[in-house]
């Protein structure tokens, strides 16, 4: 170890590298300076990454993976650090960058936004489910008459092309449809979604954006919605919606209208079922809605409310129907 | 039915190569992602690898990327697994099973019967 | 350490309930990834036993059952039957594995 009496220098690591590893993916590599001395010390590495987006952290191995986008460039530095409880040591930085790709910004998509959704899957010999995506997105202001667009996601180690797209007049694709994917209902990782294109007339900028999971996931609405009325009590029961969570991972909101006076009642819940007290005058049209609570998963979307159940009297139909 | 059917395995010397195929029968099978998972003698399950239903997306074990190369042909209905620079470690039953997913989670539903590699010299 | 634990063997006779463990990790089981379980008969194939946690594919008797608590997992068979002496493994879904296919090393199954 080093002595508090001794003069340590500090030099940079050496064959800094910035490698592409997949859509919206680097890996930084670097190695330790042949010339530095005291290797038997805990030389650490602090790793900045100065564009898109500002961030350090320090590491003791020499590489680093980074999920980040890239259509704006990427530029990072790296500097070997010796720490102790009282100082800190610094060698200078070494730096690399990766240039923004080619093409003029004007002519690269806009408005990209992507949602999720579990359906259960047609093809599976058990009752599984699948995670769909639906991407949407504007053509760039810039971009030539005959650019086509072509939309990839990344989830974990999987990387897929788009193959099913919807297009505008001039035959240009606007929207993608996974059916089936390998995106996680319950997965932390990030979802990238890269958007280039191509035109004979000039180079396409390419656009990419990382998606949280919980931020885009389009939850199903409860299934199995009843409402029945005895008296003067609003009995509604539900279940939960087609969803990797189980059944204690969600919140519903149930929506009841009084169709008679228009009042309007919203309780929010973390149970599948509500009683409510009403007047037997009036009839009810009885919706309810659901979100993964936080309990499980950071907030995020609710679901479309759920098809409305009516009850009550109606003073067009009988009360039963034989 | 479901009927996965391997063939291709046999003996090789380290550094050799050899090409796994996998028949299959009983489901429409451009549907389907496809794997290869391996058992070493008296070993447990390794998964090898995975190619999407389209066969453009593929993904590898850490132990053998950049030496095998999965692949498909829709037409033929069969998956194969191209093998290079082989190692004894490589040593195995080769198993071809669909790569199923329940909510994202892969889970391999139907396995066929395996075929022997074995690399030595 | 990436990947699943289990106990390399168990034992149990006749008629008797056995449970075989798969202990995770934050990074699989913790994160609440689905686990399957593969049944295998010496000199066969792996055959799909359980999948997503505690679901039985046509044709396995509900003799057994997966659960799922924390980091880990178990299978249970009850009324244990000659039959059933095989090994089994745990599989589920790793963030941290390229590929992110992760099984347990497998227990093997003695029926007494």
């Known amino acids: 170890d080093l002595l508090p009496d001794e003069k340590i220098s500090l030099l940079p690591p050496v064959n800094f590298t910035i490698k592409v590893t997949g859509l919206a993916q680097v890996l930084l590599q670097w190695k330790p300076n042949p010339d530095q001395e005291q290797r038997n010390v805990n030389l650490e590495y602090q790793v900045k990454i100065n564009a898109p987006k500002e961030d350090d952290y320090e590491t003791r191995i020499t590489e680093s993976k980074c999920v980040t986008i890239l259509h704006k460039g990427f530029s990072a530095s790296v500097r070997t650090i010796l720490q102790n409880d009282h100082s800190l040591l610094a060698s200078s930085w070494a730096s690399a960058e990766l240039h923004a790709p080619p093409g003029s910004p004007g002519t690269s998509i806009v408005n990209l936004t992507c949602t999720t959704n579990t359906t259960e899957d047609n093809y599976s010999r058990l009752r599984s489910y699948q995670v769909s995506l639906h991407c949407t997105w504007l053509v760039g202001t810039d971009a030539p008459e005959d650019t086509q667009y072509f939309l990839y996601y990344r989830y974990g180690s999987w990387t897929e092309e788009c193959q099913e797209y919807s297009k505008d007049t001039l035959g240009r694709n606007i929207a993608c449809w996974f059916p089936r994917t390998f995106i996680l209902s319950k997965g932390r990782d990030w979802l990238a979604v890269l958007v280039n294109g191509s035109s004979k007339h000039s180079a396409i900028r390419p656009f990419d954006q990382l998606f949280a999971l919980h931020a885009i996931d389009q939850i199903n609405p409860p299934l199995n919605v009843t409402a029945e009325i005895e008296g003067t009590r609003l009995s509604i029961q539900w279940e939960k919606p087609v969803s990797a969570f189980p059944i204690h991972c969600f919140d519903y909101e149930v929506k009841i209208h009084n169709t008679r006076n228009g009042y309007l009642q919203i309780e929010k819940l973390m149970t599948n079922a509500f009683i409510s007290i009403i007047d037997d005058l009036s009839k009810y049209d009885v919706q309810v809605r659901a979100a993964v609570s936080s309990m499980c998963r950071e907030a995020g979307l609710w679901s479309e409310w759920s098809q409305p159940i009516y009850v009550g009297n109606d003073e067009h139909k009988p009360l039963r129907e034989w | 039915q479901v009927t996965l059917k391997e063939s291709g395995g046999g003996l090789v010397q380290p550094g050799g190569s050899l090409r796994l195929s996998c028949a299959a029968s009983g489901f429409t099978f451009s549907n389907y992602a496809m794997s290869w998972v391996r058992q070493a003698p008296g070993k447990g399950l390794e998964w090898v690898s995975a190619?999407?239903?389209?066969?453009?997306?593929?993904n590898y074990a850490d132990s053998v990327k950049g030496r095998f190369t999965i692949s498909r042909d829709n037409a033929k209905n069969t998956l194969y697994l191209q093998m290079n620079s082989l190692r004894a470690e490589d040593t195995a039953v080769y198993y071809c099973?669909?790569?199923?997913?329940?909510?994202?989670?892969?889970?391999?539903?139907?396995w066929g019967q395996g075929t022997t590699v074995t690399v030595s010299s | 350490q990436a990947g699943l634990t289990q106990p390399p063997s168990v034992s149990a006779a006749p008629g008797q309930r056995v449970t075989i463990s798969c202990s995770g990790s934050?990074?699989?089981?913790?994160?609440?990834?689905?686990v399957h379980w593969y049944q295998q008969v010496p000199g066969t194939a792996p055959k799909l036993l359980i999948f997503?946690?505690?679901n039985r594919p046509s044709g396995v008797p509900d003799r057994f059952s997966g659960s799922k608590s924390g980091t880990s997992a178990s299978l249970a068979i009850t009324g244990l039957q000659a039959e059933d002496e095989a090994d089994y493994y745990c599989q589920s879904y790793d963030s941290s594995l390229s590929g992110h296919v992760v099984f347990g090393g497998g227990t093997k199954l003695t029926v007494l």
């Open positions: 934050r990074s699989n089981i913790g994160s609440g990834y689905d």
């Open positions: 099973a669909d790569y199923a997913t329940n909510y994202g989670v892969p889970y391999f539903g139907s």
């Open positions: 190619i999407n239903s389209g066969g453009k997306s593929t």
């Open positions: 997503d946690d505690n």
